[in-house]
Amino acid sequence: MDSFNYTTPDYGHYDDKDTLDLNTPVDKTSNTLRVPDILALVIFAVVFLVGVLGNALVVWVTAFEAKRTINAIWFLNLAVADFLSCLALPILFTSIVQHHHWPFGGAACSILPSLILLNMYASILLLATISADRFLLVFKPIWCQNFRGAGLAWIACAVAWGLALLLTIPSFLYRVVREEYFPPKVLCGVDYSHDKRRERAVAIVRLVLGFLWPLLTLTICYTFILLRTWSRRATRSTKTLKVVVAVVASFFIFWLPYQVTGIMMSFLEPSSPTFLLLKKLDSLCVSFAYINCCINPIIYVVAGQGFQGRLRKSLPSLLRNVLTEESVVRESKSFTRSTVDTMAQKTQAV
């Protein structure tokens, strides 16, 4: 996405004062921002505030427990991925306010917008790792007793981060800045040198590896887990199912518009009306995907409150209960130790 515009406005009434600041839009032919851009700005602002504070809190809570609690390692890595992505938001916000003018240089253009994709791949690979851990706890408890340790968890996280970085490279390499003479603007976007095949390949790989394949595998994985846990339980809690569905679904819900528009744009001609419409929605789709970066802490807090009644404890205390409860590896107890433990296991799929 973030492909460059192909249209040039009419300059008949152009009267630009060359200055490029937040108060003076560079394109005087359209002073006001489009509605999708305004919505994107609102989402970015909320995500930044909630994401930075929420994930910082999660990092703070889990960092102390990461040496001894495997669950804390998973949550710590997810929070770091989200927190990193949130750091790019003020820059992206500023760019949209300036009608997508990018005064931050080529290096920032390559790195900052790529952070959300790094987050996508890191999150989904960490989710896959966490899901594998959940699966093994249920189906291979003896193996877990013998081999499941903090060291292995950190190695798994390192592999996930490494793969995520590799998968983000295409976006990083194809991102360039381009100058427009009228209206005066520097644009940051992906440039495939008009090679539609290359653009499609990148979009398809992103869709398959970042969305469809994880969706399939996680769905199967949690179906098996839930079937097993239900069969071992007297009271079949729909609450557990709701939490699992919520945390697994959030990733896919918020990435769906980005993935759909991205794949569509790669197959459409840049001059087509549909492409131009989707181009206008680009920032909104990116901002919607960015909700992933703040949703996890919200889910942890809401779920924590739900399982503990009223919010009687402090936020860090509540989060500590939700995020650092260690799993019991004996199969019969792995999902029945406590409702809080159930929550801890389920939210790892966020």
């Epitope: 192909y6 040039t8 152009y14 004062k17 060359d18 100058e179 003479y181 005066p184």
Partner: antibody, heavy 118, light 106 residues
């Protein structure tokens, strides 16, 4: 280093067509717009318009609409200026110039002298 | 369009002398750019965004101004500075150039 190399001088008759080329090297061609500037001894420098080298969308100045066309061959990093139905007043030197978003032209071609005479 | 008027149109200066070329715009502009052109060559970017010297331009050159009045100054004239200088704006459409100021060495 950055260079804009233009095609050689042209001698044409009124009514004919001329196509002047401007080959860019030393930078990413599609990253900057390309402007065309006309210079005549009597009237000095006059901006003719520019072409968006990424999209290929041209924008002509009001005085250069109709007979003047800007085009690209992106794969060859080359911009073209075509003038149809040449007139005597088209006799001038034509420059291509790399256009910066903050308003100036930082690199210029060496110029192509066009003489229109019957 | 925004008409740029340069003055003086032609001037001679002795080596070491201070030289000022002015550029007056018919309507206000934010930035002025200056080009140097010698006979038989293409214009060279000399000063951009009112006061920034282009790469390789000697520090004896400076630019200033605001609104409708801008100037290019040479603190100490040298033989190699003999050329025609053009001002240019892009604050209003279309971009326009001044008529040029021819600077000769005495």
């Amino acid at each position: 280093q950055i260079q804009l190399v233009q095609s050689g001088p042209e001698l044409k008759k009124p009514g004919e067509t001329v196509k002047i080329s401007c080959k860019a090297s030393g930078y990413t061609f599609t990253a900057y717009g390309m402007s065309w500037v006309k210079q005549t001894p009597g009237k000095g420098l006059k901006w003719m318009g520019w072409i968006n080298t990424y999209s290929g969308v041209p924008a002509n100045a009001d005085d250069f609409k109709g007979r003047f066309a800007f085009s690209l061959e992106t794969s060859a990093s080359t911009a073209y200026l075509q003038i149809n139905n040449l007139k005597n007043e088209d006799t001038a030197t034509y420059f291509c110039a790399r256009s910066r978003y903050d308003g100036y032209f930082d690199y210029w071609g060496q110029g192509t002298t066009l003489t229109v005479s019957s | 369009e925004n008409v740029l008027t340069q003055s003086p149109a032609i001037m001679s200066a002795s080596p070491g002398e201070k030289v000022t070329i002015t550029c007056s715009a018919s309507s206000s502009v934010s930035y002025m750019h200056w080009f140097q052109q010698k006979p038989g060559t293409s214009p060279k970017l000399w000063i951009y965004s009112t006061s920034n010297l282009a790469s390789g331009v000697p520090t004896r050159f400076s630019g200033s101004g605001s609104g409708t009045s801008y100037s290019l100054t040479i603190s100490r004239m040298e033989a190699e500075d003999a050329a025609t200088y053009y001002c240019q704006q892009r604050s209003s459409y279309p971009p326009t150039f001044g008529g040029g100021a021819k600077l000769e060495i005495k």
